[in-house]
Every structure is written in structure tokens, then in C-alpha cells.
């Protein structure tokens, strides 16, 4: 199986025990790693951060010791802009710049890979979207020709029914992709002006539609129908939670809440929390399972956060196992327990360590 | 440059009330920071007393100290403990902290409380 | 309500000695490694030097050491200095953060 995880760049900026750098990571616990983002200027691939590139050098170091990992560079991400990607893939020029770009960049800098992250084509960019990804392919094929090991291609996809029928040709995609990974977590947020879990295995109780769609459940399931190759889906398990602040005494699922959580001490952004924060928030609170989701939740004062825990991925490894998918993906590492002090365990990692420790499990 | 300084502290008659305030300064409340009342009679070791998770609002008290005293974030950089029935016992040199468990700990000086008549 | 035991109070050592402070718990940390130590100066505030039981604080020489887990941890200081004279807190968090509590401290002496 694989089990593709999740760097970001920007977590090195994050204060005291928060700051990730890529010697960090463990180089045996993923079979891929991705570094998250490239950017893209002048319709070429460029680096984001002013020291991306001693970043990358640090993250392909891994491989030194670990011949077998995989690193790939994501491109895009959410501060990239859906229009800016819109542009250059609806442009057969832009287009083939940036695809001519891409080779040399992962070759110098020493990745795999190049990973696809617009987030999200519009309904107009459909079949740009494709295009783009059938071309980098055949550019990564006749790239390799040399007697080189070709490089891979991926992409992470959105979960959301609504952006799944808009956004992508998953039967067509899927043919010239490496691997897909499909974004199975943000499926509640504080728009809904209720509490819910972002990440819920299954199908709510109480889900009527358009909720009975928001759910892991439910968008593999509709992947797979679409023409996805099992072989191909890797499963996201987010190593993060969602938080909102209650607007009543009611704590619940469905509860009323005045808007996402306070920012976390050391990712500070509202409504969201890594691992690592949430094992302290722990300290003092009450933690129920949503059932039927298998899932968990915790409550402490005015503040509620849904979040996974060891139970909960391994019960999405069981899932995707029985699914046949070809393994899970992380949404990040830079988020878990990545010191191993604040989980309490004395173990780096433990949520993904404890995916792979699920997906090697017979 | 982050900091926490104490007022209110001074002398106060036995069965008094007196609130003390710790005031942050260089950053706010608008995060999840642990915010904790301290306190140390003349020669002897440090006490805690109470404290509040800025980011649930939930507080926590010292068996000893509850009913007697309140903690409460008054605004997004100040954090109260109101302390009531004063007797002789409460003299002492009360600290606010920030963060006792984290690297991103913080302590203010402190303020002096006597209570004596 | 978990009780916090420091060990011994006082010590004494020679400058460029070792000094080896205990705390005891008598139930678990959370986490097994919610515990700080202080070092306190009199008329100054405590200062942070280890938290987590084991990870040192921004600033703090790497001559203090911190170990241990759940009930038993220990603050070591090593190559004394003359500058390390103050008494010595742990203070252990837990489950339910009104059972958190300092130790009774230990006054180490350099001589």
C-alpha cells in the first residue's frame, strides 16, 4: 500500500514547538513524501518560500538513507488561486511552457514527482484540467526516454460531490495519473452554522441530503463509480481538526455555534487544529465518538473540535482495505505529533505512524 | 516584546476582597494560552491557585482555593483573580503565568499582597 | 488531590559538580510527560527551564537535564556554576488541571 504524506512549507514559520522542518520527518514512515507548494511564475514552475530550495535539498536528503521513498513537489495549493491555474492551462502556450518547465525543475532539485494541487478547476476548466494532465504525462514520458526512471504524476482531488461533477473527468484523469488523492476531510465547516465532524467515515444518522454526501463513505464510493481505478485512489486521513466555538449550552453533533474555533497556540488559524494541539486540548475536556461516523469529537468550555484519532484511522485503513484502494493519504505530517511530545506517547507521528502500522497489519 | 505585569496587590484588612489584574502585553488572548494565578508566602514555595484556558474559558481551581477566589478573562489582554474572606494565610507575592507546560512560558514580576490589620 | 514530592532539600555541591534533583508524583502525569521545572531566585520570578519532562527551554544551558515519565522525573545539573544557586520547582499537570501542582522545591546550594 501506499501511504502518501503531506509537507508543508509554510510550517517551518510556526513558533517554538510548532516550526517543522523537513529533517524532521521520519524517512521510513511514508512510501511517498509531497512537499507542499510550488508556485508558478511567468509560466514556469518557480519555488514559493525564500529558502524552498535548502527545503528541498533537506526533504531529498531523506532518500539517502531510504533509497525507496518517493518525493514529489505539489504545485498550486489554496493561496495559488483557482483563476491563476485557470489561465495557464486554458492557454495552449502557457500550457506548454509550464509543462516544458517542469521536468528540469524536479530533476535538478531532486524529486520524483510533480503533483497537481488546483484547488479548484471551475466548471469551464474541466476539460483544461484534463488536457494538462494528459500533456505533463506524455512530456514525463518522452522526458524519460534516456533511460531515465520517469517521473510520476499525481493529483489531489476534492471530495465534494458538487466540485467532483464540476471539476474533473475522473475516468479520463485517471488514465494518465500516477495516483489520485482524493481530499477526504473539510466536508463540514463553519458555514454550516452547526457542529459537525470534517472527516466522517460514514454517513451521519441524521444526513439528509446534501449531508449524505459529506462523508469518506460516500465520495469513494462515487470516485470509483466515476471510473476511478482502485488501484489508483489513495484516501486522505487529515492529521488535523475542526473546531468551532458553541453558540448554546447544546455541545452535540448539529449543535448551534457562533463561528469556527479559537486559533490553535501554534498553527493560529481559527477553526482549525493540529494533532498536536488537540492532544492538549484534551487535557480537561470531553471526548465522545460519533458512532455511526466513527469518529471522535471533543468538547471543553465554549470550544468543540472533530478530529481523528488511532481508532479512527485505523478504522479508515480497514476501510480503504476493503475497498482495495491503493492506500491512504496524510494531510500532514508537519501537523501530527511530529516531536513526540505533545501525544504523550514517546512515539514521533502517531497518527500516521499509526496508518502504517494499519495498512502493514494482515 | 511579550510580557505580563500584576496590579492591584497592596494591603487589605482580614475578611477583605481585593481583584488583582495581570495585563498582557505583545500579544492577546485570542488564542489558546493557559493562564495561571500563583502565588508565594514570605520564605515559602510557590502555590497555584487557579487558572483559565483563554481559548474555552473553562477555569480551574486549587481545592483549597475554591469558592474564595474567581478567575475570569476580563478582556482579550487581562486576565482577574478576585479574592475574597482574606485572612492572614493569603499574605503572599501572587504571580500570573502564561503557559506552564510550553516553551512559550511567561511570568509577570508579581504584586504583593499583605492582609493584616 | 496528586501529590508532588521534590527531593532532597537542600543540596550542596562544589562548583563544576553534579546535582541530581527528583520529583515524584503519586499518580501520572497527563500525557505521562506534563511536568515543568522552575528555577527561582529570591525576589524574581521562576524561570522556565525544562517542560515536558524532558525538553529545554529557549535560552537554558544545556547543562540542566530533564528525564523521566508518568510518576518519576529528574532534573539534572551538571558543571555547576555558582550562577545555578536558587531553589529548585517541578510542577506536574494533569487530567483534570485543578489536580496541577507544584513540588515543595529544593534548595541547592553551591559551594
Known amino acids: 500500500y501506499k501511504l502518501v504524506c503531506y509537507y508543508t512549507s509554510w510550517s517551518q514559520y510556526r513558533e517554538g514547538d510548532g516550526s517543522c522542518f523537513p529533517d524532521a520527518l521520519d524517512r521510513f514512515l511514508c512510501t511517498h513524501i509531497i512537499y507542499s507548494f510550488a508556485n508558478i511564475s511567468n509560466d514556469h514552475i518557480d519555488t514559493w518560500e525564500w529558502n524552498d530550495v535548502t527545503l528541498y535539498g533537506m526533504l531529498n536528503t531523506l532518500k539517502n538513507r531510504n533509497p525507496n521513498l518517493k518525493t514529489l513537489l505539489s504545485v498550486g495549493g489554496w493561496n495559488f488561486g483557482s483563476q491563476r491555474f485557470s489561465k495557464i492551462a486554458s492557454n495552449t502556450q502557457s500550457r506548454r511552457t509550464f509543462i516544458k518547465s517542469v521536468p528540469p525543475f524536479l530533476r535538478t532539485h531532486g524529486f520524483d514527482g510533480l503533483d497537481l494541487a488546483w484547488l479548484y478547476p471551475g466548471r469551464r476548466d474541466k476539460q483544461h484540467f484534463t488536457t494538462l494532465i494528459k500533456e505533463m504525462k506524455a512530456e514525463f514520458i518522452k522526458e524519460a526516454q534516456p533511460g531515465k526512471k520517469q517521473l510520476l504524476l499525481s493529483a489531489a482531488l476534492s471530495a465534494g460531490k458538487v466540485t467532483i461533477d464540476s471539476s474533473y473527468d475522473i475516468a479520463k484523469i485517471s488514465q494518465h495519473l500516477d495516483f489520485i488523492s482524493i481530499m477526504t476531510y473539510d466536508f463540514h465547516g463553519a458555514w454550516r452554522g452547526t457542529t459537525g465532524h470534517h472527516s466522517p467515515l460514514f454517513r451521519g444518522q441524521e444526513d439528509a441530503s446534501p449531508d449524505r454526501f459529506s462523508n469518506t463513505d460516500y465520495a469513494v464510493g462515487y470516485m470509483l463509480r466515476l471510473g476511478a481505478p482502485a488501484s489508483k485512489l489513495v484516501m486522505g486521513i487529515p492529521t488535523f481538526g475542526r473546531s468551532f466555538t458553541l453558540a448554546s449550552s447544546e455541545t452535540g453533533v448539529g449543535a448551534p455555534i457562533s463561528g469556527p474555533g479559537i486559533p490553535g497556540r501554534f498553527t493560529k488559524e481559527a477553526g482549525t487544529l493540529a494533532y498536536y494541539e488537540i492532544c492538549d486540548f484534551l487535557r480537561g475536556a470531553t471526548v465522545h465518538r460519533i458512532l455511526g461516523q466513527q469518529v471522535p469529537y471533543a468538547t471543553k468550555g465554549n470550544q468543540w473540535v472533530g478530529y481523528d484519532d488511532q481508532e479512527s484511522v485505523k478504522s479508515k485503513v480497514q476501510y480503504l482495505k476493503d475497498r482495495q484502494l491503493a492506500g491512504a493519504m496524510v494531510w500532514a505530517l508537519d501537523l501530527d505529533d511530529f516531536q513526540g511530545s505533545f501525544c504523550g506517547q514517546d512515539l514521533r507521528f502517531p497518527l500516521t505512524n499509526a496508518i502504517k502500522d494499519a495498512l502493514a497489519a494482515t | 516584546q511579550e510580557q505580563l505585569v500584576e496590579s492591584g496587590g497592596g494591603l487589605v484588612t482580614p475578611g477583605g476582597t481585593l481583584t488583582l489584574t495581570c495585563t498582557a502585553s505583545?500579544?492577546?488572548?485570542?488564542?489558546?494560552?493557559?493562564m495561571c494565578w500563583v502565588r508565594q508566602a514570605p520564605g515559602k514555595g510557590l502555590e497555584l491557585i487557579a487558572a483559565?484556558?483563554?481559548?474555552?474559558?473553562?477555569t480551574y481551581y486549587a481545592s483549597w482555593a475554591n469558592g474564595r477566589f474567581t478567575i475570569s478573562k476580563t478582556s482579550s489582554t487581562t486576565v482577574t483573580l478576585q479574592m475574597t474572606s482574606l485572612t492572614a494565610a493569603d499574605t503572599a507575592t501572587y504571580f500570573c503565568?502564561?503557559?506552564?507546560?510550553?516553551?512559550?512560558?511567561?511570568w509577570g514580576p508579581g504584586t504583593l499582597v499583605t492582609v493584616s490589620s | 488531590d496528586p501529590m508532588l514530592t521534590q527531593t532532597p532539600s537542600p543540596v550542596s555541591a562544589a562548583v563544576g559538580g553534579t546535582v541530581t534533583i527528583t520529583c515524584q508524583a503519586s499518580?501520572?502525569?497527563?500525557?505521562?510527560?506534563?511536568l515543568s521545572w522552575f528555577q527561582q531566585k529570591p525576589g524574581q520570578p521562576p524561570k522556565l527551564l525544562i517542560y515536558?519532562?524532558?525538553i529545554l527551554a529557549s535560552g537554558v544551558p544545556s547543562r540542566f537535564k530533564g528525564s523521566g515519565s508518568g510518576t518519576q522525573f529528574t532534573l539534572t545539573i551538571s558543571d555547576l556554576q555558582c550562577d545555578d544557586a536558587a531553589t529548585y520547582y517541578c510542577?506536574?499537570?494533569?487530567?483534570?488541571?485543578?489536580?496541577?501542582?507544584f513540588g515543595g522545591g529544593t534548595k541547592v546550594v553551591v559551594e
Open positions: 505583545g500579544f492577546d488572548f485570542s488564542s489558546y494560552y493557559y
Open positions: 499518580q501520572s502525569v497527563y500525557n505521562n510527560n506534563y
Open positions: 503565568a502564561r503557559d506552564p507546560y510550553f516553551g512559550t512560558n511567561l
Open positions: 515536558k519532562a524532558s
Open positions: 483559565i484556558d483563554t481559548g474555552s474559558g473553562e
Open positions: 510542577l506536574g499537570g494533569y487530567s483534570s488541571p485543578s489536580d496541577d501542582a
